[in-house]
Interface confidence: low
């Protein structure tokens, strides 16, 4: 991944094709790295990231990571290759058009991550019950 402020020139080595001959263009994703966030106790949040980036590689998808500890809440937005772990986790939902947050076990903090494969899909991160039904107890905590 390339941070937006050091974007490389867009050139023909980014144009690749899949097995069916379809051109795979790199995605457009929000790319603000880690920033403080006010997103808390909400069904969904906007990233408030003003930087959209063309991902460096056509296979990369959009990722958002929401973290809360005793001191602050942060939201990370990046491009990342789903074949590689991110924060030691596999991007299981990389093919999803929406960024639906799922909790991951991290000691000392609440850690949610989502990935998605439509343009700028990590601008809207979703915690809502209609999507995330895998942990009802957690939802009660979020929405109380």
């Amino acid at each position: 991944t390339i941070p937006p402020h050091v974007q490389k020139s867009v050139n023909n080595d980014m144009i690749v094709t899949d097995n069916n001959g379809a051109v795979k263009f790199p995605q457009l994703c929000k790319f603000c790295d880690v920033r403080f966030s006010t997103c808390d106790n909400q069904k969904s949040c906007m990233s408030n990231c003003s930087i959209t980036s063309i991902c460096e590689k056509p296979q990369e998808v959009c990722v958002a990571v929401w973290r809360k500890n005793d001191e602050n809440i942060t939201l990370e937005t990046v491009c990342h290759d789903p074949k590689l772990p991110y924060h030691d986790f596999i991007l299981e939902d990389a093919a999803s058009p929406k960024c639906i947050m799922k909790e991951k076990k991290k000691p000392g903090e609440t850690f949610f991550m989502c990935s998605c494969s439509s343009d700028e899909c990590n601008d809207n991160i979703i915690f809502s019950e209609e999507y995330n039904t895998s942990n009802p107890d957690l939802l009660l905590v979020i929405f109380q």
Epitope: G21, A22, K24, T52
Partner: nanobody
Framework: EVQLLESGGGLVQPGGSLRLSCAAS????????MYWVRQAPGKGLEWVSA????????YYADSVKGRFTISRDNSKNTLYLQMNSLRAEDTAVYYC?????????????WGQGTLVTVSS
């Protein structure tokens, strides 16, 4: 079926201007990021510019930054590329494209393209 029809190319002197258009059909235009790419004689494809579905985000190759402007009119399903201060090295066939656009095997990429020739 996705169809993209480029137009507006021609012969122009160095320092001149052209405006390319791309009429799109067969998909929900306003939901798709769109791209201009070009192929100079005897060379490979090169990215020129990209624009998000809403038109709010635009991107340019370093070689055209400050000279070219990409835009779109979603009500007309049309993509544009305004090219100013043209140089000889901008000579190429220009194609518009969307993500997942299929290559027509044994034919040009994304339709006929439009030829831009910059020469004195």
């Amino acid at each position: 079926e996705v169809q993209l029809l480029e137009s507006g190319g021609g012969l122009v002197q160095p320092g001149g201007s052209l405006r390319l258009s791309c009429a799109a059909s067969g998909f929900t235009f306003g939901q798709e990021s769109m791209y201009w790419v070009r192929q100079a004689p005897g060379k490979g494809l090169e990215w020129v510019s990209a624009i998000s579905g809403s038109g709010g985000s635009t991107y340019y190759a370093d070689s055209v930054k400050g000279r070219f402007t990409i835009s779109r009119d979603n009500s007309k399903n049309t993509l544009y590329l305004q090219m100013n201060s043209l140089r000889a090295e901008d000579t190429a066939v220009y194609y518009c494209a969307k993500s997942g656009t299929r290559i027509k095997q044994g034919f040009d990429y994304w339709g006929q393209g439009t030829l831009v020739t910059v020469s004195s």
